[in-house]
Every structure is written in structure tokens, then in C-alpha cells.
Interface confidence: low
């Protein structure tokens, strides 16, 4: 199916930038792995590079505004032609859920005191209003609550006295613009101004005097310029050559606003002075190689020795990585393919251990399934031997750092009937539903 092709993918926002054009296939658009595409306007933007996980979204608002609730965040597998770690297809969402608390307590309503006495009438003649008030302290609200209803109420009051008002003109308004902005049109240009009998309006009962004179004034406009001539476009010029040597590019045509040239302040030509077209070199762009993540460290050994485990004898271990994805004469991966370090082997060594403090509460699992829970642990942590942290393996090569390697067998006193891990679990509260944010925007 045809897609919209873009020249950039913005990692921070996940948006496509620099629209190249539509109606091209994903395969053609992704001849350049720096490009990105959308299957429809406003849809999910996917970069052409090999898939990897996006950054985590910000945490959604807490599912409740007071007391303990939960909140979600997500990340998305973005890219083309492959899978993210965990063998996940592009477009897939991964969720995390955690507990949250915006405000410890929930608001409680207050109650009103009794109404106070009525205040005097707001006017000394004709009809006005009078007001009485009450206090929100019976009881006072708690934790940001309030009292239902109004703190004051008003009612009409009549002084039984009549107020006559005579009309007076407000100031003249501004002259309206001339009815034509240039001479040579069909009607004689005129300007008008008005005023309102509203400073004040005359009363009806007893009747006030109306304003004397007219509410409108007119006069002729003078000194207007000649009427403007609108500009018109000349023909389109030749198409520029394709500016790229691989993938898709853009060519351009130009035209000039001179057919006729705008005169006497007439508007410039409407529309664009340039237009663009997609050009296709049909040549794939070079793709640089990228290092895979490092592999596992090999076992810690020393040449000519069967085992150095549980002994103060330094050995060596290595790990490797693979340069993947290089195509069409792209750059090779920079740096070393193999990494070597010195090590002490504590594989399967019985070591004295001590119980750790409680870990922080983990994420709620499953984030999108039924009845998610969170957990924290105390671990039996091994006490590492006090072997020298550096060694000199070869004369003249200086000191080398030595790392402990392997999975020891720590021994702790039993805690709650456990020897290695003590775990505490709790249910997660007020759990929101997992919804694809792209689908919510539609």
C-alpha cells in the first residue's frame, strides 16, 4: 500500500518531519534508513531504521486525585524490517504500572452557619437589591473541601421612590472607514459616525427627556488613491534536476508574479511561487553497520589450570559483539569486536551472606491483565572475598583491574523460613485500562 514518506524521524516526540510526499511504497521510502513513513495522515510514524524500543512515555496522571491509586506509562517498538529485543514486532506497546498518591486525604464538605441580617437596599429610589450573608464554618470543610451553595443571597427591594432620568448623548463614535478605499469605483465614497443616547438613556416612568438632534452624521471622503490592480502569475519555469544520488528527492518549478505586476497597492498573486515533485533515483542509499549489544562474558579461566573457582587466582574472560546491518557500501562498525578483562571466579562458591534492606516496591504486574500486584524483596547478599582489586599479570604492563565473576552460593541465617529471598506482595489499587494512545487521538 502507498504511504506518506518523510525525510526525518524525531526520536524525542516520535513524530515524522519534513514531508517528502505520498503515493510511494514503504520499500521505496525506506531505501534511505534515515527516512520515516506514515500509513495515513496523522497516523503512527515509523522510522525506516531497524526496530528498537522508544523512550518510556511520561507517567499518566494518577487514576484518583486523592488517596492511593495507580498510573501507567508505555513505550513502543518503532522501526521497519525486523523486531525489537524480546522478538517484538514494530508498533507493539509495552506497559508499566506503578502506585501513586497525589494527595493523602480526600476533601470533606463543610456546613453553613445561619443567615445574617439583611443589609439596606442598594438604591435610594426605584428598585434595587438587598443582600444577606452566611459563613462556611458549621462545621468548617476539611482537606480543601467547601460548602454547597452560595455564601450570600439577594432579593429585590422597592424604595417606593421614582427616579426620573433625562437622556444625554454619549460621545461620537469614530468615523467609519470610507465606503470605498479608492477613487474610480461605482459609488461616491462616504464616511459615517454615530452616537448613542446612552449617557444616560432617558427614563420611561416618569419620562426623561430624549436626546436632542440626530444619532448619525455623514460626509464625503477626499484624497483617496487610485484603485489597486491585482497581480497575476506568469508561466511555470523548467524543472530543476534531482538533487540526490540515492533514494527519493524533490525537484522544483518556479513562476513569477508579473502577468501583470501588482499596482497601486493591489494584492500580490495568490498561491505558491514554487511547486515540487518527487524524483526517484532508484538507487538504495548506503547503510552503516551498527554494533549489536555485547555478548555474555565467557567463563573466568586460567590457561593450564583446570579450575580457579573459589581461589585467589586471577584469570581472564572475554566477550564479543557483531557488526550488523551494513549494506550498499555503508561504513563498517568502529571499535573493537572483542573485549577482554581479568577476573576472580566465584562460580558456585559457598560465601557468607547477609540480608539486604527491603528493595523499593516494584512495578504492578501484569500491567494490562487482571488483579495486578506489586512486590518488594530482601535478598541474601554474598560478602565478596577481600582479594586484591588489581593485579600485575605481565612485567611492564602496569596494574589491571580484576572483577569478580560467577554466581556464588550465599549462606544466610533463615529469615521467615527462607534462605535466599523473602518477598512481600500487595495488590495495586484503582487500576486504569491500557489504551493505545494513537487510537485515543482518532
Amino acid at each position: 500500500d502507498p504511504v506518506l514518506c518523510f525525510t526525518q524521524y524525531e526520536e524525542s516526540s516520535g513524530k515524522c518531519k519534513g514531508l517528502l510526499g505520498g503515493g510511494v511504497s514503504v520499500e521505496d521510502c525506506c531505501l534511505n534508513t534515515a527516512f520515516a513513513y506514515q500509513k495515513r495522515s496523522g497516523g503512527l510514524c515509523q522510522p525506516c531504521r531497524s526496530p528498537r524500543w522508544s523512550l518510556w512515555s511520561t507517567w499518566a496522571p494518577c487514576s484518583v486525585t486523592c488517596s492511593e491509586g495507580s498510573q501507567l506509562r508505555y513505550r513502543r517498538c518503532v522501526g521497519w524490517n525486523g523486531q525489537c529485543s524480546g522478538k517484538v514486532a514494530p508498533g507493539t506497546l509495552e506497559w508499566q504500572l506503578q502506585a501513586c498518591e497525589d494527595q493523602q486525604c480526600c476533601p470533606e464538605m463543610g456546613g453553613w452557619s445561619g443567615w445574617g441580617p439583611w443589609e439596606p437596599c442598594s438604591v435610594t429610589c426605584s428598585k434595587g437589591t438587598r443582600t444577606r450573608r452566611r459563613a462556611c464554618n458549621h462545621p468548617a470543610p476539611k482537606c480543601g473541601g467547601h460548602c454547597p451553595g452560595q455564601a450570600q443571597e439577594s432579593e429585590a427591594c422597592d424604595t417606593q421612590q421614582v427616579c426620573p432620568t433625562h437622556g444625554a448623548w454619549a460621545t461620537w463614535g469614530p468615523w467609519t472607514p470610507c465606503s470605498a478605499s479608492c477613487h474610480g469605483g461605482p459609488h461616491e465614497p462616504k464616511e459615517t459616525r454615530s452616537r448613542k443616547c446612552s449617557a444616560p438613556e432617558p427614563s420611561q416612568k416618569p419620562p426623561g427627556k430624549p436626546c436632542p438632534g440626530l444619532a448619525y452624521e455623514q460626509r464625503r471622503c477626499t484624497g483617496l488613491p487610485p484603485c489597486p490592480v491585482a497581480g497575476g502569475w506568469g508561466p511555470w519555469g523548467p524543472v530543476s534536476p534531482c538533487p540526490v544520488t540515492c533514494g527519493l528527492g524533490q525537484t522544483m518549478e518556479q513562476r513569477t508574479c508579473n502577468h501583470p505586476v501588482p499596482q497601486h497597492g493591489g494584492p500580490f498573486c495568490a498561491g505558491d511561487a514554487t511547486r515540487t515533485h518527487i524524483c526517484n533515483t532508484a538507487v538504495p542509499c548506503p547503510v552503516d553497520g551498527e554494533w549489536d549489544s555485547w555478548g555474555e562474558w565467557s567463563p573466568c579461566i586460567r590457561r593450564n589450570m583446570k579450575s580457579i573457582s573459589c581461589q585467589e587466582i586471577p584469570g581472564q574472560q572475554s566477550r564479543g559483539r557483531t557488526c550488523r546491518g551494513r549494506k550498499f557500501d555503508g561504513h563498517r562498525c568502529a571499535g573493537q569486536q572483542q573485549d577482554i578483562r581479568h577476573c576472580y571466579s566465584i562460580q558456585h562458591c559457598p560465601l557468607k551472606g547477609s540480608w539486604s534492606e527491603w528493595s523499593t516496591w516494584g512495578l504492578c504486574m501484569p500491567p494490562c491483565g487482571p488483579n495486578p500486584t506489586r512486590a518488594r524483596q530482601r535478598l541474601c547478599t554474598p560478602l565478596l572475598p577481600k582479594y586484591p582489586p588489581t593485579v600485575s599479570m605481565v612485567e611492564g604492563q602496569g596494574e589491571k583491574n580484576v572483577t569478580f565473576w560467577g554466581r556464588p552460593l550465599p549462606r544466610c541465617e533463615e529469615l521467615q523460613g527462607q534462605k535466599l529471598v523473602v518477598e512481600e506482595k500487595r495488590p495495586c489499587l484503582h487500576v486504569p485500562a491500557c489504551k493505545d494512545p494513537e487510537e485515543e487521538e482518532l
Epitope: 472607514p177 465606503s179 470605498a180 478605499s181 454615530s194
Partner: nanobody
């Protein structure tokens, strides 16, 4: 393009009544000031009655109390009710709607075609 179409003129005896209407083809009424003008032979065009978008009306002194201007926004129509007609009311009557231009630096006017009223003594 907006067109103003007038109807309702004719010959009438002194002391009689006439009602003009003026319909617009586009919905400009709610944002326009609506005016009725008249032009007697050999005279300047004269503003007879005006109605602003917020409902304020005003009349020339010679017709005050006899003529009434009104509008119907649903029908895009402005009316002029003329009572107690006099021979000096004989003229061609024009309806006019105007608003500010989009940049507020000019005015945009729409005019009716004009209708003859003759009041015989």
C-alpha cells in the same frame, strides 16, 4: 457574491402606505448595518433610515414617526414600512448593507437595484 433584491414600490395616493422589502442572497445580515436611501430627481442620495447589528435605529427628521425599519435574520431580509406618505416622498428608494472589510481598513458595501415610489397629490 452577495445580491440585494428589492420589491414593493409603486404608485400610491397621499396619506397611503407602502412596505418595501430587500432580500440578500448571502448571510451578511447579522454582521451588517442596514440602510435605506432615496434619491429624488436632480437631488443627492439621502439616508432615510438605518439599523445597526445591535438593533439601534435612526431616521431622517423628515420621515421620523412615519417610517419604520426592521429586519428578519432568518429570511436575510430588511423591511421599510412607510405610512402617511406625502408627495415629497416621491423618489427612487435603495437598500444598502455594509460591514467592515476583513482588515478593518475599508468598508464592503452591497446595494439593491433601486425601486421607484410615486406619491400623487
Amino acid at each position: 457574491q452577495v445580491h440585494m433584491v428589492e420589491s414593493g414600490g409603486g404608485l400610491v395616493q397621499a396619506g397611503g402606505s407602502l412596505r418595501f422589502s430587500c432580500a440578500a442572497s448571502g448571510n451578511i445580515f447579522t454582521i451588517s448595518t442596514l440602510d435605506w436611501y432615496r434619491q429624488a430627481p436632480g437631488e443627492q442620495r439621502e439616508l432615510v433610515a438605518t439599523l445597526t447589528p445591535d438593533g439601534i435605529t435612526d431616521y431622517a427628521g423628515s420621515v421620523k414617526g412615519r417610517f419604520t425599519i426592521s429586519r428578519d435574520n432568518a429570511k436575510n431580509t430588511v423591511y421599510l414600512q412607510m405610512n402617511s406618505l406625502k408627495p415629497e416622498d416621491t423618489a427612487v428608494y435603495y437598500c444598502n448593507a455594509w460591514r467592515y472589510s476583513d482588515d478593518y481598513r475599508g468598508r464592503v458595501d452591497y446595494w439593491g437595484q433601486g425601486t421607484q415610489v410615486t406619491v400623487s397629490g
